[in-house]
């Protein structure tokens, strides 16, 4: 009685259960009455990452330097190449098919989270008591200078973009 379902890592063809090809190999010939499934290793720059019956291996992803990409992990016969972005850039999608420059946080905003190869800079407004006077992809909000600890007094109040200005105490008192 011909089978209607096959075991794991097998497939049904011509009323026979044939072994799937292992990762890293492609199908040449289905199994027959006389032979096991015939599989061949994927070529250079090709891969198959599952037990399969594919007659062609997939091409490794190309990390195009013109798009700001570089190889993070070289592909094998069983895995695809993983791309990431050059320093200062990050991926535009999870598949990392192209890169964009990390955004900078404007004055009045500081870096909450520095960008990675896959995520952009996260900025946050500088709260009261903190400031940022530069546009930067790395600088956090800095605390205002404490005039008191320097035996000075505030001459000009700080903002989210400027530090306080300290000055000497009034000696006429």
């Amino acid at each position: 009685e011909p089978p209607t379902a096959c075991r794991e890592k097998q497939y049904l063809i011509n009323s026979q259960c044939c072994s799937l090809c292992q990762p890293g190999q492609k199908l040449v010939s289905d199994c027959t009455e006389f032979t096991e499934t015939e599989c061949l290793p994927c070529g250079e720059s090709e891969f198959l990452d599952t037990w399969n019956r594919e007659t062609h291996c997939h091409q490794h992803k190309y990390c195009d330097p013109n798009l700001g990409l570089r190889v993070q992990q070289k592909g094998t016969s069983e895995t695809d190449t993983i791309c990431t972005c050059e320093e200062g850039w990050h991926c535009t999608s999870e598949a990392c098919e192209s890169c964009v420059l990390h955004r900078s946080c404007s004055p009045g905003f500081g870096v909450k989270q520095i960008a990675t190869g896959v995520s952009d800079t996260i900025c946050e407004p500088c709260p009261v008591g903190f400031f940022s006077n530069v546009s930067s992809a790395f600088e956090k909000c800095h605390p205002w200078t404490s005039c008191e600890t320097k035996d000075l007094v505030v001459q000009q109040a700080g903002t989210n973009k400027t530090d306080v200005v300290c000055g000497p105490q009034d000696r006429l008192r």
């Epitope: 072994s19 040449v28 010939s29 027959t32 009455e33 006389f34 032979t35 096991e36 015939e38 061949l40 007659t55």
Partner: antibody
């Protein structure tokens, strides 16, 4: 439909090289394997060797040193070459596909001076 | 090289009677995948061999159900439940588990 047809020289002199071609139709040699069997007159079947779909070959232990099997997928042909022939190589030579029951009609090769 | 030994060499049978042919292998024919690639052919006089049974016990399409195959490991049997005139010829066992593939020496079935 699936067909295999052998074409041989018929008569070959001792010590010469035998060349037989198996021309197939109805399937691709890149996806199917083909093997060769011979049968001397009044005797049994002898497996000679095979050409796998992927291009690799296997040979009978006793014939390995003088047998070469190759294929031209674009021409749908598998070739058998056997050197240093003797009278003992007189036989009907068959090519066979490695699934189902697809045999060529066979070609008789006589080795004689 | 693996040897397949068939017995008997010659088998005279009366029409309508059963027949049995043995095939012994010099090593196990069970493959690593669990398949056993032992097959049976019939070669009628003046014809190419014809596949009867593949992988021990599977009847090839169009083969009458009076033919059956059994066995495992190294011992295999072809049985014909009731011999008919068209069953005359030479029966060969064959294995494709191990390279090089091999054929048995043949069993000639004739009518008494």
């Amino acid at each position: 439909q699936v067909q295999l047809q052998e074409s041989g020289p018929g008569l070959v002199k001792p010590s010469e090289t035998l060349s037989i071609t198996c021309t197939v139709s109805g399937f691709s040699l890149s996806r199917y394997s083909v093997y060769w069997v011979r049968q001397p007159p009044g005797k049994g079947l002898e497996w000679m060797g095979m050409m796998w779909g992927g291009g690799s070959t296997d040979y009978s232990t006793s014939l390995k040193s003088r047998l070469t099997i190759s294929k031209d997928t674009s021409k749908s042909q598998v070739s058998l070459k056997m050197s240093s022939l003797t009278a003992a190589d007189t036989a009907v030579y068959y090519c066979v596909r490695t699934d189902g029951d697809y045999w060529g009609q066979g070609t008789l090769v006589t080795v004689s001076s | 090289e693996l040897q397949l030994t068939q017995s008997p060499l010659s088998l005279p049978v009366t029409l309508g009677q059963p027949a049995s042919i043995s095939c012994r292998s010099s090593q196990s024919l069970a493959s690593s995948s669990g398949n056993t690639y032992l097959h049976w052919y019939l070669q009628r006089p003046g014809q190419s061999p014809r596949l009867l049974i593949y992988k021990v016990s599977n009847r090839f399409s169009g083969v009458p159900d009076r033919f059956s195959g059994s066995g495992s490991g190294t011992d295999f049997t072809l049985k014909i439940s009731r011999v008919e005139a068209e069953d005359v010829g030479v029966y060969y066992c064959s294995q494709s588990t191990h390279v090089p593939w091999t054929f048995g020496g043949g069993t000639k079935l004739e009518i008494k």
